[in-house]
Amino acid sequence: GPASVPTTCCFNLANRKIPLQRLESYRRITSGKCPQKAVIFKTKLAKDICADPKKKWVQDSMKYLDQKSPTPKP
């Protein structure tokens, strides 16, 4: 059969805000195979950090990154 695409899920969400200057990009985790919806921020030190998309700082950070590079996010 066709090769299956691995699903990335978030189990632990960041409990602290990340400085905007440290953020490189983000992607949304919306797969029904995951226990919760999440946002994964990639930092400028190449680290992936899971965060709660319902939190204001997460929404503000996504908006900041959208304005920096206005390419549509999946």
Epitope: P19, Q21, L45, A46
Partner: antibody, heavy 118, light 108 residues
């Protein structure tokens, strides 16, 4: 417990080289960015360099750019600072320290003294 | 680079005193500020992060406040082990990290 144990300091002549090491234990070293920070005698703290968890990204202070190289060996849980073309104003206690992902620095090694003198 | 300026550069106080150290950033850093304590011959120790959050294991007599450009570290009742040098650090910019010049807290 979380520990960063440093080695490799000493007295060296201007223009020569030295390599500092920082051995980590008590935490998942390969998951963390790492810094070197230095402190000249009687002075404040000066950031030197940072490296990403996987070694793919490195940044340096202008004062050491082109002379110092930060690296890591995750299989040995060890961070390094290769210091070339040393100058007298590089004399300082050098600390290795962990990056928290949030802009602050923790934990810290015990420090190692580097003296550049003729 | 963002410059950090601490005041005073040194302060003398007695056990039980309330002490305040201030830190000013050269530009707005929101709440991205950390405070460290350093004793002679020892490494710095993280006390406060995000301007006002107490690092795990740090006594509650330490507190931080401020946002934007002006920040304060307060020790509510000085203990003998608190005599040390304190540094602020801006955590806003990347990759450059900058520290204040330090405030030495001495026994009166």
């Amino acid at each position: 417990q979380v520990q960063l144990v440093q080695s490799g300091g000493g007295v060296v002549q201007p223009g020569r080289s030295l390599r500092l090491s920082c051995a980590a234990s008590g935490f998942t070293f390969s998951s963390y960015g790492m810094h070197w920070v230095r402190q000249a005698p009687g002075k404040g703290l000066e950031w030197v360099a940072v490296i990403s968890y996987d070694g793919s990204i490195k940044h340096y202070a202008d004062s050491v750019k082109g002379r110092f190289t930060i690296s890591r060996d995750n299989s040995k849980n060890t961070l390094y600072l290769q210091m070339n073309s040393l100058r007298t104003d590089d004399t300082a206690v050098y600390y290795c320290a962990g990056d928290t992902d949030y802009g602050d620095i923790d934990p810290w090694g015990q420090g190692t003294m580097v003296t550049v003198s003729s | 680079d963002i410059q950090m300026t601490q005041s005073p550069s040194s302060v003398s106080a007695s056990v039980g005193d309330r002490v305040t150290i201030t830190c000013r950033a050269s530009q707005d850093i929101s709440s991205w500020l950390a405070w460290y304590q350093q004793k002679p011959g020892k490494a710095p120790k993280l006390l406060i992060y995000a301007a006002s959050s107490l690092q795990s294991g740090v006594p509650s007599r330490f507190s931080g406040s401020g946002s934007g450009t002006d920040f304060t570290l307060t020790i509510s009742s000085l203990q003998p082990e608190d005599f040390a040098t304190y540094y602020c650090q801006q955590a806003s910019s990347f990759p450059s990290i900058t520290f204040g010049q330090g405030t030495r807290l001495e026994i009166k």
